[in-house]
Interface confidence: low
């Protein structure tokens, strides 16, 4: 009679994490008598998965009634597969004896586990940056298998090309992680912008996972200042306004200086929001010209989001100020930027 063969028809089986894996094995003869055992891996370090004769294997069930005398099908089902179950499984025939001895092994079935990547987590720089600067964003996703994965970066739907991606570990593993760093150049219009990391994997069936970061948490748009003199409100009084435009975030403190001396300090509160997400604010100062004998240098000094103060000055020519009410020829705007 022809010698018994152990047939494992599937060279490989791919299963999604959480599903059951069926590993097929049949023998071609009932002789010699002896049990079947399933192992993961080969050699002395192989791991026993199932023993037909004895033992408790709660995740393993036989597909057919392997206890029947004439049974030649020793296929098994392993439930609740995880990435840790990946490997090559061997169906091995033993010859009955004391002890049983290994008679013949099947060629092996490689079990690969398809595990979904975790939701990508995008993180930006620790400190805010201003427009024209390049900032780095990182994206991480873990626990996927197989290793083949595609990661793409977008800013407001436009694909980014300046990024570096690594998949770890380099060698074989039960599951993998991906780490990518993208460089993004900030613009003044980026308060409402989003950076998106998109991960595509075979387990996601064409529906990629996305992680996002809002550039509002990263960007600082410094204000522009404009100091202007308004029409005279009353005799000897000049109204000077400081327009603080296009700043983000809102945290801003303004100080008025008259000839270098602090006149008033206030914090931006009732701001107006621009379409691009930046803010505008206006502060005014009423100057009593008659209280000054000499020209007055008015300075609007702004400290934005804890950054060094920026300022804009305006010179009031007191000597040229006529005393008639309603006159607006009293001052010249010689604004200059100072830090």
């Amino acid at each position: 009679e022809e010698e018994l063969q152990v047939i494992q028809p599937d060279k490989s089986v791919s299963v999604a994490a959480g599903e059951s894996a069926i590993l097929h094995c049949t023998v071609t003869s009932l002789i010699p008598v002896g049990p079947i055992q399933w192992f993961r891996g080969a050699g002395p370090a192989r791991e026993l998965i199932y023993n037909q004769k004895e033992g408790h294997f709660p995740r393993v069930t036989t597909v057919s009634e392997s206890t029947k005398r004439e049974n030649m099908d020793f296929s098994i089902s392993i439930s609740n597969i995880t990435p840790a179950d990946a490997g090559t499984y061997y169906c091995v025939k033993f010859r009955k004896g004391s002890p049983d001895t290994e008679f013949k092994s099947g060629a092996g079935t490689e079990l690969s586990v398809r595990a979904k990547p975790s939701a990508p987590v995008v993180s930006g720089p620790a400190a805010r940056a201003t427009p024209q600067h390049t900032v780095s964003f990182t994206c991480e996703s873990h626990g996927f298998s197989p290793r083949d994965i595609t990661l793409k970066w977008f800013k407001n739907g436009n694909e980014l090309s300046d990024f570096q991606t690594n998949v770890d570990p380099v060698g074989e593993s039960v599951s993998y992680s991906i780490h990518s760093t993208a460089k993004v150049v900030l613009t003044r219009e980026d308060v409402h912008s989003q950076v998106i990391c998109e991960v595509a994997h075979v387990t996601l069936q064409g529906d990629p996972l996305r992680g996002t970061a809002n550039l509002s948490e990263t960007i600082r748009v410094p204000p522009t200042l404009e100091v202007t003199q308004q029409p005279v409100r009353a005799e000897n009084q000049v109204n000077v306004t400081c327009q603080v435009r296009k700043f983000y975030p809102q945290r801003l403190q303004l100080t008025w200086l008259e000839n270098g001396n602090v006149s008033r300090t206030e914090t931006a509160s009732t701001v107006t929001e621009n379409k691009d997400g930046t803010y505008n604010w206006m502060s005014w100062l009423l100057v009593n010209v008659s209280a000054h004998r000499d020209d007055v240098k008015l300075t609007c000094q702004v400290e934005h989001d804890g950054q060094p103060a920026v300022s804009k000055s305006h010179d009031l020519k007191v000597s040229a100020h006529p005393k008639e009410q309603g006159s607006n020829t009293a001052a010249e705007n010689t604004g200059s930027n100072e830090r």
Epitope: E159, F163, T165, N166, A200
Partner: antibody, heavy 117, light 108 residues
């Protein structure tokens, strides 16, 4: 930036053949490189890719076991393990737009492989 | 298995005319599609990526559109230099890195 294939020649069926793609003007550690072939009078057929910064490879399902892609710091090799007459084609190497963005903005001129008895 | 179907396989149009080539994916690939132009004896040349973004130096007469599974390429104001074979390519991960069968454009 440019790429050039070499190693194409007439071979007999079953004789392994290695094609080499030499890159210049960019670093292979930053970009994926794919191999694409085109049989005479036929369309383009993607074979596989080796990614930048690692030796990770991926193959078209039909190409697994028939081709092997490997690389050095400046070259990417394609080995046809056991050529058949159906492997007669012009073989192109192509640079991915970025690592992981696998459309191709730089192509080599191609190298012709003829498999015949 | 994933595939890309290009139609028609050949199209003829006069100088100054317009042709539309269609590329259909067997499953959704978002906007991960590129178009190439290939002339005899030359390697392909990238025309469009991300379904609709023109590659550097490519004429605006070439217009890609669509998403998910349907991707048309429109070539308007045809010139004799546009005579070539055009291929679409999906790059939605290596398992779907596939070229369409190609469309030959003949300019009269």
């Amino acid at each position: 930036q440019s790429m050039e294939e070499s190693g194409g020649r007439l071979v007999t069926p079953g004789t392994p053949l290695t094609l080499t793609c030499t890159a210049s003007g960019f670093s292979l550690s930053n970009y994926g490189v794919s191999w694409v072939r085109q049989a005479p009078g036929k369309g383009l057929e993607w074979i596989g890719i080796i990614y930048g910064g690692s030796d990770i490879t991926a193959y078209a399902s039909w190409a697994k076991g028939r081709f092997t892609i490997s690389k050095t710091s400046t070259t990417v090799d394609l080995t046809i393990t056991s050529p058949t007459t159906e492997d007669t084609a012009t073989y192109f190497c192509a640079k991915s737009y970025t690592n992981g963005m696998d459309y191709y903005n730089i192509w080599g001129p191609g190298t012709l492989v003829t498999v015949s008895l | 298995a994933f595939d890309l179907t290009q139609t028609p396989s050949s199209v003829e149009a006069p100088v100054g005319g317009t042709v539309i080539i269609k590329c259909q994916a067997s499953q959704s690939i978002s906007s991960y599609l590129a178009w190439y132009q290939q002339k005899p004896g030359q390697p392909p040349k990238l025309l469009i990526y991300s379904a609709s973004t023109l590659a550097s130096g490519v004429s605006s007469r070439f217009k890609g559109s669509g998403s998910e599974t349907q991707f048309p390429l429109t070539i308007s104001d045809l010139e004799s230099a546009d005579a070539a074979t055009y291929y679409c390519q999906s790059y939605y991960g290596s398992r779907s890195n596939v070229f369409g069968g190609g469309t030959e454009v003949v300019v009269k």
